[in-house]
Interface confidence: low
């Protein structure tokens, strides 16, 4: 706490300016008024305080609102908001989403900061739901952001703003978290046509079921090996050696160089030796000629 | 070096079908990542966009030309073409053939253009 | 359709000086806007995307501001190859519905 000292004479600070730099700490107590800061906050970042006189501007700021800032004066805290603790932030009703843009450039280039977190958790549960403009912002800041939701918080997350997600924001997500993504994008992109589809698509395709690859497959789309190597095994497995092959297109050849990894190596296993043979591809490990496939699943489920 | 080059009458009767060639040499036609699409310029205008082709023949069109307009591409001759039917004195202008990506709607790469005038 | 409104038609600005062009959509277009630069006789060429990012080989004196539904180009030292006709374009509509503004004419005071 800084002591409590009268004023010098000629020294009441009438603005923010540059002239403050120059006050020491117990004079910026003493002189500036807590109101008229919060009024001039937008002049704080252009004039180069220490990090010592920024902690004097922040308890003057704390003091005039225990309850937490207003907005208006948190759209212009500048620099000041790497001052913050996740306490602090707690306090705040952020509703703006240029004020959240204003925050994040502060923090722009650096990972996300607990305070950071906190400021995009009161962000979005004040708003509801994460929709488009809000996901667009986060994004472009935080391009892993979207991955680092629980698939519980991805639950709150509408289809309509799947339009903002860009393939490398989910770069990073996990495989529940894409079961969560894929059903609300195919229903974002359900009025496309077959080629923008996949396009758009393509990304979310580590949460499809077998039926939508199968779908996928008739309709000339040309899967890559990389999304196919992200598909789930589960719903890989039951795909023929046809289905395999349109899905893939002139990208099945990619199939020999993938034969040991997951989920190849274990849809190769499932497959009819003859059948692997038909792509001229040298696939070696199917079921071997004249051998009686047993689907164990369905035997479970009769029984 | 990427090049398109546009090919067609340069004069069209009114009421008749505009068609235009447009030929990708120095890359691929068949590339997932771009689309194809056709832009026109009036004599002394601004710029239109009339219509994009993906490789595998699906099309999107400029909704106040769409019920007169055709893009279709021919991956195996590495060209898109464009069809403009009854047409009038308005479709007069230079039309430009250019790649966009299929993740924007920009257009990076452009062809030089051809004129097609539209008289009797 | 989305409109976009560009401003001034006609810049008269002297070589060596900044020149500043707008572009106005008619409802937002986020980020999604194109700056293309048409010399006589030539097709256009594309300079600035997603508002603010260069295009390969455009030189670092072409910058770009903006969001929403009010742009700017900004050309900070007129050289003599600059003076032509730009056009901006939005890609945010979906489906495709691409609009250009009227163009821009820059020439030499």
């Known amino acids: 706490e800084v002591e409590k000292t009268a004023c010098p004479s000629g020294k009441k600070a009438r603005e923010i300016d540059e002239s403050l730099i120059f006050y020491k700490k117990w004079e910026l107590e003493a002189c500036v008024d807590a109101a008229l800061l919060a009024t001039q906050m937008d002049r704080v970042n252009a004039i180069p305080f220490t990090y010592e006189q920024l902690d004097v501007l922040k308890h003057k700021l704390d003091e005039l609102y225990p309850q937490g800032y207003p907005e208006s004066v948190i759209q212009h805290l500048g620099y000041l908001f790497l001052k913050m603790s996740p306490e602090d932030i707690r306090k705040w009703n952020v509703t703006s989403l240029e004020t959240l843009k204003a925050l994040l450039e502060v923090n722009k280039g650096h990972e996300m900061s607990p305070q950071v977190a906190t400021l995009i958790d009161r962000f979005v549960k004040g708003r509801g739901q994460l929709d488009k403009d809000t996901l667009d912002t986060l994004t472009a800041f935080y391009p892993g952001y979207l991955c680092s939701l629980s698939p519980e918080e991805l639950s709150s997350v509408p289809p309509s703003s799947i339009w903002a997600v860009r393939p490398q924001d989910l770069d990073t997500c996990d495989p529940r978290q894409l079961d969560v993504l894929y059903p609300k994008a195919r229903l974002a992109f359900q009025n496309m046509n077959g080629s923008e589809y996949f396009v758009k698509i393509q990304s979310f395709l580590g949460g499809a079921p077998t039926e939508d690859l199968k779908a996928l497959s008739q309709q000339n789309v040309s899967m890559d090996l990389a999304t196919f190597m992200k598909l789930r095994t589960d719903a890989v497995l039951p795909l023929t050696v046809a289905e395999v092959q349109k899905l893939l297109g002139p990208h099945v050849e990619g199939l020999k160089a993938e034969e040991r990894h997951r989920p190849v190596r274990d849809w190769i296993l499932r497959q009819r030796q003859d059948d692997l043979d038909t792509l001229g591809l040298g696939l070696q490990g199917g079921i071997p000629n004249g051998y009686l496939v047993l689907d164990l699943s369905m035997q479970e489920a009769l029984s | 070096q990427l090049q398109l080059q546009e090919s067609g009458p340069g004069l069209v009767k009114p009421s008749e079908t505009l068609s235009l060639t447009c030929t990708v040499s120095g890359g691929s036609i068949s590339s997932s990542s771009y689309y194809w699409g056709w832009i026109r310029q009036p004599p002394g205008k601004g710029l239109e966009w009339i219509g994009s082709v993906y490789y595998s023949g699906s099309a999107f069109y400029s909704p106040s030309l769409k019920s007169r307009l055709q893009i279709s591409v021919d991956t195996s001759k590495k060209q898109f073409s464009l069809k403009l039917s009854s047409v009038t004195a308005a479709d007069t202008a230079v039309y430009y053939c250019a790649r966009r990506p299929y993740k924007s709607g920009l257009f990076d790469f452009w062809g030089q253009g051809t004129l097609v005038t539209v008289s009797s | 359709e989305i409109v976009m409104t560009q401003s001034p038609a006609t810049l008269s600005v002297s070589p060596g000086e900044r020149a500043t062009l707008s572009c106005r959509a008619s409802q937002s277009v986020s980020s999604n806007l194109a700056w293309y630069l048409q010399k006589p006789g030539q097709a256009p060429r594309l300079l600035i995307y997603g508002t603010s990012t260069r295009a390969t080989g455009i030189p670092a004196r072409f910058s770009g501001s903006g969001s929403g539904t009010e742009f700017t180009l900004t050309i900070s030292s007129l050289q003599s190859e600059d003076f032509a006709v730009y056009y901006c374009?939005?890609?945010?509509?979906?489906?495709?519905?691409?609009?250009f503004g009227q163009g821009t004419k820059l020439e030499i005071k």
């Open positions: 374009q939005q890609y945010n509509t979906w489906p495709p519905e691409y609009t």
